[in-house]
């Protein structure tokens, strides 16, 4: 009984199409597959950023795979051929591993790369990123930001830079069509006559860095002798009502402070007839149904009632 063997895939490589971290892993079928013409060969692919403890594992019949990586670090990948048990009259047969690596040769010392990169997607409409220049870089150093997400033909440079002392320290992005719920890749590189500048790579999803506008049109309504309903409207803009959480701060007679988090645009407050003053503010955040993370809005303008019997009227700002 001869032992069945299969070769690893050929020409295994990691290809960088210039998408700032979204890479192609590709390979060719193994040599000497003639014996297995009736068989569908599969490939087990493992890959990770160098330094990561865990491998991502994919089993595929294709000759390519695409995924996002952190280009601040190197990438390693390995692949082997799998012959299913149907092809071998018994157990699955695996080839040896073919391995490859990829990294961008770093230019410049780490301190020259941008510091404190911060990106906020204001009201799910306007993306603004800002950074500080690298430590010890001279004023002739300038930074350029490039971005890419699936749907763009190629990486694009920032349209509107924010400057300080002639240096680019931020970017206001143009309209980003169909850019949420997918990885958004950024590279900030730099140039200087004096020394090479280290590039920085960032990846995030836009819906997770949204800072909404604050709620508007805060009102009070007396529901009963001991209940007041606080109401407000969703912030203006494209974010649907179902995507909001709210935090309320209520102050009664300058003493009691009540805070609460709610999912819709009302909150019922128990009060006594002795309440002489009532103030509240609200802020908004994108909730877990629409994102994995988010940033609280600024607080709304304060809405106050004082001096009249709350039971007599609906109070509008």
């Amino acid at each position: 009984d001869t032992e069945i063997k299969v070769n690893p895939p050929q020409d295994f490589e990691i290809v960088d199409p210039g998408y700032l971290g979204y890479l192609y892993l590709q390979w060719q079928p193994p040599l000497s597959l003639d014996h297995f013409k009736e068989c569908t060969v599969e490939y087990e692919l493992k890959y990770r950023n160098i330094g990561s403890e865990t491998w991502k594992t994919i089993i595929t019949k294709n000759l390519h795979y695409k995924d996002g990586f952190d280009l601040n670090k190197g990438i390693e990948a390995k692949i082997h051929t799998l012959l299913p048990w149907q092809c071998t009259n018994g157990s699955e047969v695996q080839s040896s591993w073919a391995e490859t690596t990829y990294w961008i040769s770093p230019q410049g010392i780490p301190e020259t790369k941008v510091q404190d990169m911060d990106c906020v997607y204001y009201n799910w409409q306007y993306l603004l990123c800002s950074w500080k220049p690298g430590i010890g870089v001279l004023l002739d150093t300038n930074y350029n930001l490039f971005y890419w997400y699936e749907g763009l033909d190629h990486a694009l440079q920032c349209v509107d830079y924010i400057k300080a002392d002639g240096q680019n320290i931020g970017c206001r992005f143009p309209y980003l069509e169909a850019s949420d719920y997918k990885d958004f890749y950024i590279c900030v590189n730099g140039s200087s006559e004096n020394k090479p500048i280290r590039s920085s790579y960032f990846t995030f999803q836009l819906q997770n860095i949204v800072k909404p506008l604050p709620p508007v049109y805060l009102t009070f309504t007396r529901e009963s002798s001991c209940e007041i309903k606080l109401k407000w409207s969703i912030p203006l803009g494209p974010i649907p009502a179902r995507c909001f959480d709210y935090e309320i701060e209520i102050r009664e007679d300058d003493t009691t402070l009540v805070t609460a988090t709610v999912e819709n645009e009302t909150y019922t407050l128990k009060t006594t007839n002795e309440t002489r003053q009532l103030c509240f503010v609200v802020r908004s955040k994108v909730n877990i149904y629409c994102s994995d993370d988010g940033i609280w809005s600024e607080w709304s303008d304060k809405q106050c009632w004082e001096g009249e019997d709350l039971s007599k009227k609906t109070l509008l700002r």
């Epitope: 306007y126 694009l156 349209v159 509107d160 924010i162 320290i169 143009p174 309209y175």
Partner: antibody, heavy 119, light 111 residues
């Protein structure tokens, strides 16, 4: 609730200067560019310049030949436009107008300030 | 400076009919894969209102009957079904290069 509230109408003599203010509210002042646009009677709109309140960076329309100065006071969320060496053809309504970036146009405008230059 | 030329200067259209306004730039206003072309509506005694940015994107709160198209040097604003409240002057504007420049305006009236 975005609002841009401009200072009131002005009547000036030729050769004088005028300074128009624009108080912004309802948004984060430093996140948006502030443009100044004027409209003379029966004329097309004319862009005068813009300031980035975030960093104070300014672009001017060189057609105004150094007569225009745009400034901002971020603590007061207010932008200013000063036009010097006034002449009769500077009689116009002057608007401040907010825009996020060059690809977004100008989405909110002040109510306008009429400046009349007359001897 | 980039010169913006609008046509026609004035236009009379029946209620419910389509209105089309054209704008030509003296050079391309495309860059970074974006057309830096905006359209505004101005009613008497009021500041302009943003209708369309980046050639085809609707401004906030703009009715769906307003649409923009074009690239490079030639652009069009279309009102699919004219309403009485659409009577105004319409301006195109390029924001590719400083100084930003406006077209001369098109006065839209009801026939």
């Amino acid at each position: 609730q975005v609002q841009l509230v401009q200072s009131g109408a002005e009547v000036k003599k030729p050769g004088a200067s005028v300074k128009v203010s624009c108080k912004a509210s309802g948004y984060t002042f430093s996140n948006y560019l502030m443009n100044w646009v004027r409209q003379a009677p029966g004329q097309r709109l004319e862009w005068m310049g813009r300031i980035d309140p975030y960093d104070g960076d300014i672009d001017y329309n060189q057609n105004f030949k150094d007569r225009v100065t745009i400034t901002r006071d971020t603590s007061a969320s207010t932008a200013y436009m000063e036009l010097s060496s006034l002449r009769s053809e500077d009689t116009a309504v002057y608007y401040c107008a907010r825009g996020y970036g060059t690809a977004y146009g100008v989405d909110y405008w002040g109510q306008g300030t009429l400046v009349t230059v007359s001897s | 400076d980039i010169v913006m030329t609008q046509s026609p200067d004035s236009l009379a259209v029946s209620l419910g009919e389509r209105a089309t306004i054209n704008c030509r730039a003296s050079e391309s206003v495309d860059n970074y894969g974006i057309s830096f072309m905006n359209w505004y509506q101005q009613k008497p005694g009021q500041p302009p209102k943003l209708l369309i940015y980046a050639a085809s994107r609707q401004g906030s709160g703009v009715p769906d009957r307003f649409s923009g198209s074009g690239s490079g040097t030639d652009f069009t604003l279309t009102i699919s079904s004219l309403q009485a409240e659409d009577v105004a002057v319409y301006y195109c504007q390029q924001s590719k290069e400083v100084p930003w420049t406006f077209g001369g305006g098109t006065k839209l009236e009801i026939k």
